[in-house]
């Protein structure tokens, strides 16, 4: 519902930190020649740096990295039946966030 | 760290749900004539539907949205110097979600 | 379909600094590693630097390292690579490329290229 | 970091003709391979990836073949359209590394 007429209270900064987003499992990831397959699942979570900083030189960016494998099934479609495969995509999750510089390489570790 | 070699786990699909993502408080929101001035906070948290569904047919919809209204500061640069006013930016926050064919319009209560 | 363009290229004296962009659009541009290849007049190709789909994973050559840097922004499918301390020898034209989930993939789509001339 | 030498620099060949281009890595590269066509002018293109998977869309005269260390390139019928400059690279290690580039002329 609507509700009916709030106060507006004072905007909260969306600070600058993990937060889970959706990665889309793209087929091109799994097999770049071929398309009679579908991925399982075609989605999954990631922790990712989000937010803002307090001004525009400065960007919310990653300083720590793991990478996740993760094991999809390829379900290929052979003669109108399924044939299912496994496959593995690498994921990455993003650990600790900071406010840097635009300019400045940031190190992962 | 990049970490170790480790087993794929099976992949868990982002179901279709709320997730927390970060809104930027576009100046044009604010006043779309002038664009001498700051906002203040640049981005906020909001509720959003994301996910994925069994099929391509099929979306992540809301089903249930709830407009809040928060204060932000407009920050003017008059002859060097801060003048502060304050806005109110309508936020839409998702409070709950459907997978939902995609032709079909969405109801929102 | 798939469409990388760049933009950002121009003259730029010795020692100066340039901001170069790549519009990604016709994908899902934050499942991919990305990648700017350059290449020099009359001369071959030479990898410049690549990124992670996250953006949390960056690599770069010898020859730029500490010098470029490479981002991303996915909320805006944009890619960039900023260019400092600038030489005489990267004067190119600069390709962005989709570089596949890894970084050793091979690069399957291509921008136009746009073109960085080193020179006072 | 890994040196790909590529032969011949150039080569002139006419229609029809089958031509083969090598590429050769300083160490291993495994299948790590990929090859490029590159027309003046234009950006780089794709041909095959993996050493010796045709990327879609690619004519099916182009054909890889190779592991380890030597790899080859083959143009079964050379087409009009064929005549540009062809790169390896390696994606292998980094620095990723290309080769010089074998440029292919109308005879």
């Known amino acids: 519902s609507l509700g009916s007429l709030t106060i507006a209270e004072p905007a909260m900064i969306a600070e600058c930190k993990t937060r889970t987003e959706v990665f889309e499992i793209s087929r091109r990831l799994i097999d770049r020649t071929n398309a009679n397959f579908l991925v399982w699942p075609p989605c999954v979570e990631v922790q990712r740096c989000s937010g803002c900083c307090n001004n525009r030189n400065v960007q919310c960016r990653p300083t720590q990295v793991q990478l996740r494998p993760v094991q999809v099934r390829k379900i290929e479609i052979v003669r109108k039946k399924p044939i299912f495969k496994k496959a593995t995509v690498t994921l990455e999750d993003h650990l600790a966030c900071k406010c840097e510089t635009v300019a400045a390489a940031r190190p992962v570790t | 760290s990049l970490g170790s070699l480790t087993i794929a786990e099976p992949a868990m699909i982002a179901e279709c749900k709320t997730r927390t993502e970060v809104f930027e408080i576009s100046r044009r929101l604010i006043d779309r004539t002038n664009a001498n001035f700051l906002v203040w906070p640049p981005c906020v948290e909001v509720q959003r539907c994301s996910g994925c569904c069994n099929n391509r047919n099929v979306q992540c919809r809301p089903t249930q949205v709830q407009l809040r209204p928060v204060q932000v500061r407009k920050i003017e640069i008059v002859r060097k110097k801060p003048i502060f006013k304050k806005a109110t930016v309508t936020l839409e926050d998702h409070l709950a979600c459907k997978c939902e064919t995609v032709a079909a319009a969405r109801p929102v209560t | 379909e798939v469409q990388l363009v760049e933009s950002g290229g121009g003259l730029v004296q010795p020692g100066g600094s340039l901001r170069l962009s790549c519009a990604a659009s016709g994908f899902t541009f934050s499942s991919f590693w990305m990648t700017w290849v350059r290449q020099a007049p009359g001369k071959g190709l030479e990898w410049v630097a690549s990124i992670s789909a996250g953006g949390g994973i960056t690599h770069y050559p010898d020859s730029v390292k500490d010098r470029f840097t490479v981002s991303r922004d996915n909320a805006k499918n944009s890619l960039y690579l900023q260019l400092n301390s600038l030489r005489a020898e990267d004067t190119a034209v600069y390709y962005c490329a989709e570089s596949g989930g890894d970084i050793y993939s091979d690069f399957d789509y291509w921008g136009q290229g746009t073109l960085v001339t080193v020179s006072s | 970091d890994i040196q790909m030498t590529q032969s011949p620099s150039s080569l002139s060949a006419s229609v029809g003709d089958r031509v083969t281009i090598t590429c050769r890595a300083s160490?291993?590269?495994?299948?790590?391979l990929n090859w490029y066509q590159q027309k003046p002018g234009k950006a780089p293109k794709l041909l095959i990836y993996a050493a010796s998977s045709l990327q879609s869309g690619v004519p099916s005269r182009f054909s890889g073949s190779g592991s380890g260390t030597d790899f080859t390139l083959t143009i079964s019928s050379l087409q009009p359209e064929d005549f540009a400059t062809y790169y390896c690279q390696q994606s292998y290690s980094t620095p990723l590394t290309f080769g010089g580039g074998t440029k292919v002329e109308i005879k």
């Open positions: 160490q291993s590269i495994s299948n790590y």
